[in-house]
């Protein structure tokens, strides 16, 4: 018994005069805007996006929207076309949804915010945006009160008219419409494809948060990793950083390239490498390989407990007004607009701390 290193877990609620607001990362579930896909993009990435077959032809499809099909048929006419160099990172950057077009309104603690307050970040969903990233020398925003008026409220247009037609199942095309959101500490990168939650158009979604500070013990009392990150890519250790680090190594090892969202200096995967290696390899790692990416718990971490609720938007009463305000049809408003409210429930944080049972 003397050699048993027991621990106890202490729970505490700590009142605070202010709390650091978390980073909020959001991604449109559609990775590439239809209007931004050029003839050269289609030539290089058409098969990856299931828009072309392996003979550079539009596949036989009864599912196509006539207008979209007409545009694609014109772009897919490669007679006398000379392909230009193509880079997946540049494609994601140029063709991904632009926060300046999506963001219809933004308020933090009642004050107006704008697209400039969102930093571009690449994830497996492509071009995404983080509010309050705390990077580029910007201070981390604070909040002094709990409740909806003291957090972030944004209205977004998800731009479904720009969604790529889905004529096949690929990792780069989505059956869903909306955004994915992750609320996370500024000390860890987003891992939104695995840890994000979905927000649907046609709803105002309220996310009530509670900050939780977790303190774990290292061996032999617990299993946390007390060492600083052994990584070329991240400054501080987190499970997310470790997993991204590991996924990058796995892809470079299997495919000799990295996905657009992965750090490092390996070459970016080509569309062919995405299709033939990177997508299936990463799917295998995430779904099947239980051993390659074993990431230890850090000794200190901040997470955010969340409670979600939703109401319909627009109401019958406001549909006409919003349609006029944004110069869109009522149907467009119903299919594309969402409001997201993220706030602290109360101005306190919870500590969950492992302590040695006896010294």
């Amino acid at each position: 018994y003397y050699f048993c290193y027991h621990h106890v877990t202490k729970l505490d609620e700590v009142a605070a005069s202010q709390l650091t607001f978390p980073a909020v990362t959001l991604c449109n579930l559609n990775e590439f805007r239809f209007s931004q896909v050029s003839k050269n993009d289609l030539y290089h990435a058409g098969e990856l996006l299931a828009l072309l077959n392996n003979r550079y032809e539009i596949p036989d499809t009864q599912m196509a929207d006539e207008k979209q099909l007409e545009i694609l048929q014109d772009k897919a006419n490669f007679r006398s076309f000379k392909p230009k160099p193509f880079n997946m990172r540049e494609f994601y950057d140029r063709a991904g949804h632009d926060i300046r077009d999506m963001l219809l309104s933004c308020h933090f603690r009642g004050e107006a915010c704008s697209a400039e307050d969102f930093k571009v970040v690449f994830t497996r969903y492509g071009k995404c945006y983080t509010f309050n990233s705390g990077q580029d020398g910007r201070p981390r925003l604070k909040t002094m009160k709990g409740g909806t008026g003291n957090g972030l409220e944004i209205m977004l247009d998800i731009q479904q008219d720009e969604y790529l037609p889905v004529w096949g199942e690929t990792d780069e095309t989505s059956f869903e419409a909306g955004i994915k959101v992750q609320i996370h500490s500024q000390d860890e990168p987003p891992f939104i494809d695995q840890l994000g939650f979905g927000v649907a158009p046609g709803f105002q979604t309220f996310v009530s948060c509670q900050e939780q500070r977790l303190i774990y013990l290292p061996s032999p009392w617990g299993t946390c990793n007390a060492v600083t990150m052994d990584s070329d890519f991240f400054d501080s250790y987190s499970i997310t950083a470790c997993r991204i680090d590991c996924e990058t190594r796995y892809l470079v090892e299997n495919c000799n390239c990295r996905m657009v969202h992965m750090p490092g200096d390996a070459p970016y995967c080509t569309p062919e490498q995405y299709k033939e290696c990177a997508d299936p390899a990463l799917d295998f790692l995430v779904e099947k390989d239980q051993e390659y990416c074993v990431c230890e718990m850090p000794c200190n971490l901040t997470r955010y407990g969340k409670e979600l609720s939703m109401v319909k938007i627009p109401s019958k009463a406001s549909a006409k007004y919003l349609a006029k305000k944004f110069n869109k049809s009522e149907q467009y408003i119903g299919e594309n607009i969402l409001v997201l409210d993220i706030f602290f429930e109360v101005l306190n944080y919870e500590t969950i701390e492992q302590k040695k049972a006896y010294e």
């Epitope: 295998f284 099947k288 390659y292």
Partner: antibody, heavy 116, light 107 residues
């Protein structure tokens, strides 16, 4: 180039033992799970056993459980299959394969014949 | 264990024919299915992985489709070199299992 080279097959009497080896090259051996697959003469493919990259987890087909032991030496980039209490129905070509999002490559196979 | 049922077990066809081989899993295996071609005395050759991905160097007349429990391998226009035995394999979960094989022979 990623390569697997299976060896150690031969003729053995029923009840006897044999140890197969599979030498790997061209990839980080310890990062990948590995499997043995066999094929009896004129028959189909049968998965025999698998092992995780570290060697911590092992898996067996019911037909060989308790008789065969899979192991690996990551310092030597080698996979092993220790076969005990061999039976006539274990006669087959044994292939080693690298497990991942695709099972590629396979070794060329080593023939095990169990006969008196 | 997951059972893989392949059909037909024998298939007679002529050069230029379009042929389809099906594989049914006893429970969902997502897309973790591979197709192999094997010729007598040789190791299996990977054709398709993750249900629909064509292995590098494999002619484009081979294609795979399906997910969940139903999968197909299609050869769009049979060539003389394609007469062989074909196997499907699930690698979704241990114990990994193969179909019983489809022997493709000249009509």
């Amino acid at each position: 180039e990623v390569q697997l080279l299976a060896s150690g097959g031969g003729l053995v009497q029923p009840g006897g033992s044999l140890r197969l080896s599979c030498a790997a090259s061209g990839f980080t051996f310890s990062s990948f799970a590995m499997s043995w697959v066999r094929q009896a003469p004129g028959k189909g493919l049968e998965w025999v056993s698998g092992i995780s990259g570290s060697g911590v987890s092992t898996y067996y087909a019911d037909s060989v459980k308790g008789r065969f032991t899979i192991s690996r030496d990551n310092s030597k980039n080698t996979l092993y299959l220790q076969m005990n209490s061999l039976r006539a129905e274990d006669t087959a070509a044994y292939y080693c394969a690298k497990e991942a999002y695709k099972w590629q490559p396979w070794g060329q196979g080593t023939l095990v014949t169990v006969s008196s | 264990d997951i059972q893989m049922t392949q059909s037909p077990s024998t298939l007679s066809a002529s050069v230029g024919d379009r042929v389809t081989i099906t594989c049914r899993a006893s429970q969902s295996i997502s897309s973790w299915l591979a197709w192999y071609q094997q010729k007598p005395g040789k190791a299996p050759k990977l054709l398709i992985y993750k249900a629909s991905n064509l292995e590098s160097g494999v002619p484009s007349r081979f294609s795979g489709s399906g997910s969940g429990t139903e999968f197909t391998l299609t050869i769009s226009s049979l060539q003389p070199d394609d007469f062989a035995t074909y196997y499907c394999q699930q690698y979704n979960s241990y114990s990994y299992t193969f179909g019983q094989g489809t022997k493709l022979e000249i009509k």
